[in-house]
């Protein structure tokens, strides 16, 4: 998901204990709400909800090292990966637990990054070079976004990489920069 955007071809993905992509065991308990931060209120009737805030999606915690060429972060960073189909908050935990997904018949709902956070990492390099400082952008929470047939595929493609793309633009969270600028950022070792 998001971490691919860092040009860290050698990025190591280390799922935290109990945080594997498979549904956590506790989700099998009918009374347990999904851990998604933005789970929202349970709908009055699961199939009639129109409000995106009433949908929920999973936030999976992954631990990874940030790498840049031969250099690697001293400590791993933990970030969220927004995962899975969105469904009504009340149904989602049960449906996952039983291995069934609720699928909306009308508009599509996708689980995408909502909020972000910055974190400084120290990159340790071989050969006795001083540690480099680097800041990375990590997903802090996920949300369900309602997609209609008017949303094209390129927008869907963006969801995965928006999490990790370094940002600089004029707006709080612009979707993208020019390809040239992004490429330049990746080519410059930090």
């Amino acid at each position: 998901q998001g971490w691919q955007a860092f040009k860290n071809d050698a990025t190591e993905i280390i799922p935290e204990l109990g945080e594997y992509p498979e549904p956590p065991p506790e989700l099998e308990n009918n009374k347990t709400m999904n851990r998604a931060e933005n789970g929202g209120r349970p709908p009055h009737h699961p199939f009639e909800t129109k409000d995106v805030s009433e949908y929920s999606c999973r936030e999976l915690h992954f631990t990874r090292y940030v790498t840049d060429g031969p250099c690697r972060s001293a400590k791993p960073v933990t970030e969220l990966v927004c995962s899975g189909q969105c469904g009504p908050a009340r149904l989602l935990p049960n449906a996952i637990g039983r291995g069934k997904w609720w699928r909306p018949s009308g508009p599509d709902f996708r689980c995408i990054p909502d909020r972000y956070r910055a974190q400084r990492v120290q990159l340790l390099c071989p050969g006795g070079e001083a540690p480099r400082a680097r800041k990375v952008r990590l997903v802090a929470s996920c949300k369900c976004k309602r997609l209609t047939r008017f949303h094209n595929q390129s927008e869907l493609k963006d969801f995965g990489t928006e999490a990790a793309r370094p940002q600089k633009g004029r707006k709080p969270r612009p979707r993208a920069r020019s390809a040239k600028a992004n490429q330049a950022e990746l080519e410059n070792a930090y």
Epitope: D68, C71, R115, Y116, R117, A118, Q119, R120, C125, E129, A130, P131, R132, A133, R134, K135, V136, R137, A140, P166, Q167, K168, K171, P172, R173, A181, A184, E185, N188, A189, Y190
Partner: antibody, heavy 119, light 107 residues
């Protein structure tokens, strides 16, 4: 539009403390580190340190460790810098600057706060 | 600390001239460098990030380049409004460090 609005000029006596503020607007405050920079009269710029508003984690330039303290108030999107034990060497303009990850730190600056230390 | 040695400390040029100034890093193999312009009484303004990328809204007469640990800011055709002091900043190693500045005057 991203804006960083700093508090007004300060005239303080040697040995005293000063706390200057930087009010952020136009973006999600916790998404970006906030740095503080010192510029003595007619001189270059010195990085004092920065703070991660999301976690409160601070990193200081060794030169300013022990005299400068960086804090934030997340609820009001304000970053603060307090300088203690002021001397004439601390007379300067202090800037806050938003750090835009590795792409371009310091793309946005406050207007600066002039601190004058005088008996 | 990584020292950024900026030269010249001041220079005078005529309108339309090509102007160059440099910053040299005292150490470090992977310096990420920005260039700033500062006019009297104002906060610095970002011109170039990542050594060579032009910040949004900055005129294309400004450009940046690097050769190893040497970094150059070039103004291809000097204009009146370019009268200012220019600083470089390295932000790959802690603490971040600025160059001493180059004061640009118009002849």
């Amino acid at each position: 539009e991203v804006q960083l609005q700093q508090s007004g000029p300060e005239l303080v006596t040697p040995g005293a403390s000063v706390k200057i503020s930087c009010k952020a607007s136009g973006y999600t405050f916790t998404d970006h580190y906030m740095s503080w920079v010192k510029q003595s009269h007619g001189k270059s710029l010195e990085w004092i340190g920065d703070i991660n508003p999301y976690s409160g984690e601070t990193t200081y330039n060794q030169k300013f460790k022990g005299t400068a303290t960086l804090t934030v108030d997340k609820s009001s999107s304000i970053a603060y810098m307090e300088i203690r034990g002021l001397t004439s060497e601390d007379s300067a303009v202090y800037y806050c600057a938003r750090d835009d990850y590795d792409a371009s730190p310091f793309a946005y600056w406050g207007q600066g706060t002039l601190v004058t230390v005088s008996a | 600390d990584v020292q950024m040695i900026q030269s010249p400390s001041s220079l005078s040029a005529s309108l339309g001239d090509i102007v160059t100034m440099t910053c040299q890093a005292s150490q470090g193999t992977s310096i990420n460098l920005n260039w700033f312009q500062q006019k009297p009484g104002k906060a610095p303004k970002l011109l170039i990030y990542g050594s060579s990328n032009l910040e949004d809204g900055v005129p294309s007469r400004f450009s940046g380049s690097r050769y190893g640990t040497d970094f150059t800011l070039t103004i291809s055709s000097l204009e009146d409004e370019d009268l200012a002091t220019y600083f470089c900043l390295q932000h790959s190693y802690l603490p971040y460090t600025f160059g001493g500045g180059t004061k640009l005057e118009i002849k």
